[in-house]
């Protein structure tokens, strides 16, 4: 029975080229994690695997950094980085647990006055 | 390279208790599960339960709840299961073997450890 | 508490294809129950080839795969080789434990 839960920050704004911290955290399982992935709709963004550490995607190298923790570092966001992002927990022996965190990037101007669930 | 080496060869009375160790190397010790599985002579398999390396709990399959223990030692890279009230039917080959989350289950096992529970 | 069975024994040539497969006394076998096939081979031990259904450790050769084949779990060898010759295990989860069928003895001749 896979009884964990994964909280994540939720749904997050942020302004254009500023960053942001994704985050997700699994509770309520004995599970053992062996590995996350973070992922944008279809596209693999990073990798931290138990053995081998980090992987982050070639063509996000520039604008993605690992942690804090389990967690992701998204820099120099653009308005094309609004949309939904996974965090996917494979663990053993429950197997995969995913998280989902919604993230707008607005303009600087509307971001300042609207943040709603901004990250410290 | 990965490897998991087991404690030696063990003769037991009926009754007795017997501790089994599992040395990992080749890897983070606390970044993957352990499980205990046991094969009797001319036997299948036996999953006996698994210990959360990195918080230290373990979970035990119902039929040795309350005869078994599996416990850490971090600092050596060591898992131990013990089995208590021993009768012949205990008679076995003992396995530790590694839990991964990626594509779930187990991939590297010890050697084996033979437990002879005899009067 | 579940029974998985596996056929005893079969036989294959060097070359040819052979399927093993792992069913469930509860019904279809799903990806939840995260297939495992273990190999063991006379005086060596276990070796974990697939895990997770269809994944295949970083030693297991190409030759194995795993998948879902008519609700069993299935074990595919394509071009067996005499090395193959040994005893094969399959294991499923069951929410909070793992059950292993008997074993199926393999025959490269």
């Known amino acids: 029975m896979m009884t964990g839960t994964i909280e994540t920050t939720g749904n997050i704004s942020a302004e254009k080229g500023g960053s942001i911290i994704l985050q997700c955290h699994l509770s309520s399982t004995t599970a053992q994690v062996t590995q996350v992935n973070w992922e944008q709709q279809d596209q693999l963004l990073a990798i931290c695997n138990a053995d081998l550490g980090w992987h982050i995607s070639p063509s996000f190298k520039d604008r993605v950094a690992p942690g804090p923790g389990l967690g992701l570092t998204l820099q120099s966001l653009t308005v094309n980085d609004t949309g939904e992002y996974f965090c996917i927990y494979h663990t053993y022996p429950d197997g995969t647990y995913t998280g989902r965190i919604f993230l707008e990037v607005l303009e600087s101007s509307v971001a300042e006055h609207g943040a709603r669930f901004q990250i410290p | 390279q990965v490897q998991l080496v087991q404690s030696g060869a063990e003769v037991k009375k009926p009754g007795a208790s017997v501790k089994v160790s599992c040395k990992a190397s080749g890897y983070t010790f606390t970044n993957y599960g352990m499980n205990w599985v046991r094969q009797a002579p001319g036997q299948g398999l036996e999953w006996m339960g698994w210990i959360n390396t990195y918080t230290g709990e373990p979970t035990y399959a119902q039929k040795f709840q309350g005869r078994v223990t599996m416990t850490l030692d971090t600092s050596t890279s060591t898992a131990y299961m013990e089995l208590s009230s021993l009768r012949s039917e205990d008679t076995a080959v003992y396995y530790c073997?590694?839990?991964?989350?990626?594509?779930?289950?187990?991939?590297?096992w010890g050697q084996g450890t033979l437990v002879t529970v005899s009067s | 508490q579940a029974v998985v069975t596996q056929e005893p024994s079969l036989t294959v040539s060097p070359g040819g294809t052979v399927t093993l497969t792992c069913g469930s006394s509860t019904g279809a076998v799903t990806t939840s129950n995260h297939a495992n096939w273990v190999q063991q081979k006379p005086g060596q031990a276990f070796r974990g080839l697939i895990r997770?259904?269809?994944g295949r450790g970083s030693w297991t050769p190409a030759r194995f795969s795993g998948s879902l084949l008519g609700g069993k779990a299935a074990l595919t060898i394509s071009g067996a080789q005499p090395e193959d010759e040994a005893e094969y295990y399959c294991?499923?989860?069951?929410?909070?434990?793992?059950?292993f069928g008997g074993g199926t003895k393999l025959t490269v001749l």
């Open positions: 294991a499923l989860w069951f929410s909070n434990h793992w059950v």
């Open positions: 997770g259904t269809n």
């Open positions: 073997s590694r839990g991964n989350g990626y594509y779930v289950g187990m991939d590297y």
